[in-house]
């Protein structure tokens, strides 16, 4: 998904939460220097995904992928790319 | 930078009502099975997380959005 390129750490954390993988979540949260209370909070969200099973995780992953690849987001990504190109051109 | 639609989705997941969150999801995926699942997850998070937990989760999101990796 193109949007993952714009904020990879967000998608790392989201998919670690939705996956139910505690180790992966810890690794992702370390990258943003999350405190212990912050980790506890994120694990509570992860618990909900785990408790509701695989189908629940797949469906919510589908929602995030759909939003991320929607015109609302892709339009945003295109706009950002255009602005980056302008800046690069001016920089030269 | 994170897409505003994604940011709104996550914010409502943590701070919105179940209706507000599911209505937002419905704008992108209006399938009953998806929307019921979204409500179940939202209800679970609301039941498990204290206000302090939610503030901590929002704090993680702030760190994510301001990270060089975003």
């Amino acid at each position: 998904v193109k949007m993952a390129e714009t904020c990879p750490i967000f998608y790392d954390v989201f998919f670690a939460v939705a996956n139910g993988n505690e180790l992966l979540l810890d690794l992702s949260l370390t990258k943003v220097n999350a405190t212990e209370p912050e980790r506890t909070a994120m694990k509570k969200i992860q618990d909900c995904y785990v408790e509701n099973g695989l189908i629940s995780r797949v469906l919510d992953g589908l929602v995030m992928t759909t939003i991320s690849s929607s015109k609302d987001c892709m339009g945003e990504a295109v706009q950002n790319t255009v602005e980056d190109l302008k800046l690069n051109t001016l920089g030269r | 930078e994170i897409c505003p639609a994604v940011k709104r989705d996550v914010d409502l997941f943590l701070t919105g009502t179940p209706d507000e969150y599911v209505e937002q999801v419905a704008q992108y995926k209006a399938l009953p099975v998806v929307l019921e699942n979204a409500r179940i997850l939202k209800n679970c998070v609301d039941a498990k997380m204290t206000e302090e937990d939610k503030e901590n989760a929002l704090s993680v999101l702030d760190k994510i959005y301001t990270s060089p990796l975003c």
Partner: antibody, heavy 123, light 107 residues
């Protein structure tokens, strides 16, 4: 918060008509399917009718088909149940209920209910 | 129409008891099943949907399970506020149907 208020119930003779209303507030009315569910005195629950969020589809329980009509006015946040050719067996408390899930979620899960209005069909 | 059958019709229990109500469908309804609680003179209240999903504000002592044709509602530790009538309801079709109800009364 979600509030549903039914009105229009009363005592009516068999064969006559009655129109029930349900005024809704506290949510995005035009996003949700709306239902009528009834309960005869001392009995269980029976779903009566549904109207989709945009009014495009309507479904009824077999026993009221051709006699009852569900409708909605999204500008006034109100749904109606027009009941014609009433029978003694239609005597019940009629509840207005909102679908739990919006838009495509006209799945008949009754997330919110009104307090009900009593319809008595008797000569 | 799909017929829903609840058992028992009446259940006598004490505060603190674990209570289980069963609901059977005449044909498979997958996981499209909801449970409601109703107190005398009041409208029903949604407890559980999609067989096991707890509705907002419903205490964790309520839980639902099952799929296909057999479902259960469990109250892990009955509280004074839980004495009421409980209904299951299938929504696999656009003609939803309810069970006949199970009254949970004080022993």
């Amino acid at each position: 918060q979600v509030v549903l208020v039914e009105s229009g119930g009363g005592v009516v003779q068999p064969g006559r008509s009655l129109r029930l209303s349900c005024a809704a507030s506290g949510f995005t009315f035009s996003s949700y399917g709306m239902h009528w569910v009834r309960q005869a005195p001392g009995k269980g629950l029976e779903w009566v009718a549904v109207i989709w969020y945009d009014g495009s589809n309507k479904y009824y329980v077999d026993s009221v088909k051709g006699r009852f009509t569900i409708s909605r006015d999204n500008s006034n946040n109100t749904i109606y149940l027009q009941m014609n050719s009433l029978r003694a067996e239609d005597t019940a408390v009629y509840y207005c209920a909102r679908s739990l899930i919006p838009v495509a979620g006209t799945d008949p899960i009754f997330g919110y209910w009104g307090q009900g209005t009593l319809v008595t069909v008797s000569s | 129409d799909i017929q829903m059958t609840q058992s028992p019709s009446t259940l006598s229990a004490s505060v603190g008891d674990r209570v289980t109500i069963t609901c059977r469908a005449s044909q498979s309804v997958s996981s499209w099943l909801a449970w409601y609680q109703q107190k005398p003179g009041k409208a029903p209240k949604l407890l559980i949907f999609k067989a096991s999903g707890l509705e907002s504000g419903v205490p964790f002592r309520f839980s639902g399970s099952g799929s296909g044709t057999e479902f259960t509602l469990t109250i892990s530790s009955l509280q004074p506020d839980d004495f009421a009538t409980y209904y299951c309801q299938q929504y696999n079709t656009y003609s939803p149907t309810f069970g006949q109800g199970t009254k949970v009364e004080i022993k």
